[in-house]
């Protein structure tokens, strides 16, 4: 099997009304706290240059990011959703665990560092811009994977 | 240069099926989601499906779920829009359209120049 | 299916700046980073004039820019120009991963 076939989400992740409202719901509870409008994290700049097959694993360095650094920073803000979606989002992470691509993946790293760059330069803005960005995390998650 | 050809239109009574294609080239096709948009004479635009690069997430507005069905052949780079239990508010000029960018089909950036299906008795 | 709310009709004389608005529920345009802008004019395909709720793509004139805030997303046409004159539809994807149009405003250069 090649190496990406394990970069796959069942549709039924994403087909639990529930959950999909809570995190479009967290992602707007943010974005109104969202003043500097004319970054997007999610949007052309990162998927340049990545293939569609690839994408999967582009997302799931985003993901774990957004985890890591970005919502557990923030887990005290934008109850209830909040301590909803983590574990949802936790769940996605580990399906994605042994999703890995072979070959080169030099534009997916560089365009995942100027992400997290564009997050680390903005301090607790760019925590808060990535939580309101929810919504394109997650369809970009259901659309790549 | 992208290109999106549609073809397929024709009459069809009311209840009749069609079968909509759309032939893409000038870009990598199985790095794109793709949509059918439709516009009825004298009227507004209407999303009518999605699907992503690889078909496996396809989405229906409200008005066509159950009786049409989106497809895509990345060997062939075409995309197909089969429409069963056809009805006269289904009459409207039928666009095929791609995401600006790889990893967001919603954002249409490119149109073909649309199939016209007329739904009459 | 829901609805994304545009006035039918917006009017303008050359030079001037003008906005249309396009409003939705919570759980349209309020709660997505996924509004786009269409222009059409009569007898032609759709053409994408503003994506992201305020990407531009390259060859679109700067003189249009696309904002949210809010249920609520506006494009602004400023230095409005004869070829202005056209159809434009908002559109944004919704929660059950559906795309809705707005219902077109048609706007009108004065003069």
């Known amino acids: 099997l090649p190496i990406n076939s394990q970069c796959k989400l069942e549709a039924a992740n994403f087909q639990q009304p529930y959950i999909v409202n809570r995190t479009f719901m967290l992602a707007k509870e943010a974005s109104l706290a969202d003043n500097n409008t004319d970054v997007r994290l999610i949007g052309e700049e990162l998927f340049r240059g990545v293939k569609a097959k690839d994408q999967c694993y582009l997302m799931k360095q985003v993901l774990n990011f957004t985890l890591e650094d970005v919502l557990l920073p923030q887990s005290d803000r934008f109850q209830p959703y909040m301590q909803e979606v983590v574990p949802f989002l936790t769940k996605l992470s580990s399906h994605l665990s042994p999703c890995h691509i072979s070959g080169d993946d030099q534009n997916i790293q560089k365009n995942v560092r100027q992400l997290k760059e564009t997050v680390q330069k903005l301090g607790e803005s760019g925590e808060i811009k990535a939580i309101g960005e929810l919504d394109l995390l997650f369809m970009s998650l259901r659309n790549a994977c | 240069e992208v290109q999106l050809v549609e073809s397929g239109g024709g009459v069809v009574r009311p209840g009749g099926s069609l079968r909509l294609s759309c032939a893409a080239s000038g870009f990598t096709f199985d790095d794109y989601g793709m949509n059918w948009v439709r516009q009825a004479p004298g009227k507004g635009l209407e999303w009518v499906s999605g699907v992503n690069w690889n078909g496996g997430t396809r989405d229906y507005a409200a008005s066509v779920k159950g009786r049409f069905t989106i497809s895509r052949d990345n060997a062939k780079n075409s995309l197909y829009l089969q429409m069963n239990s056809l009805r006269a508010e289904d009459t409207a000029l039928y666009y095929c359209?791609?995401?600006?960018?790889?990893?967001?089909?919603?954002?249409?950036?490119?149109w073909g120049r649309g199939t016209l299906v007329t739904v009459s008795s | 299916q829901a609805v994304l709310t545009q006035p039918s009709s917006v009017s303008g004389s050359p030079g001037q700046s003008i906005t249309i608005s396009c409003t939705g529920a919570?759980?349209?345009?309020?709660?997505?980073?996924?509004v786009s802008w269409y222009q059409q004019h009569p007898g032609k395909t759709p053409k994408l004039i503003i994506y992201?709720?305020?990407k531009r793509p390259s060859g679109v004139s700067n003189r249009f820019s696309g904002s949210k805030s809010g249920n609520t997303a506006s494009l602004t046409i400023s230095g409005l120009q004869a070829e202005d004159e056209s159809d434009y539809y908002c559109a944004s994807l919704v929660s059950d991963f559906s795309v809705v149009f707005g219902g077109g405003t048609k706007v009108t250069v004065l003069g």
């Open positions: 992201d709720v305020n």
């Open positions: 919570s759980g349209d345009v309020g709660a997505y980073n996924f």
């Open positions: 359209a791609r995401g600006w960018y790889s990893g967001a089909a919603w954002n249409m950036g490119y």
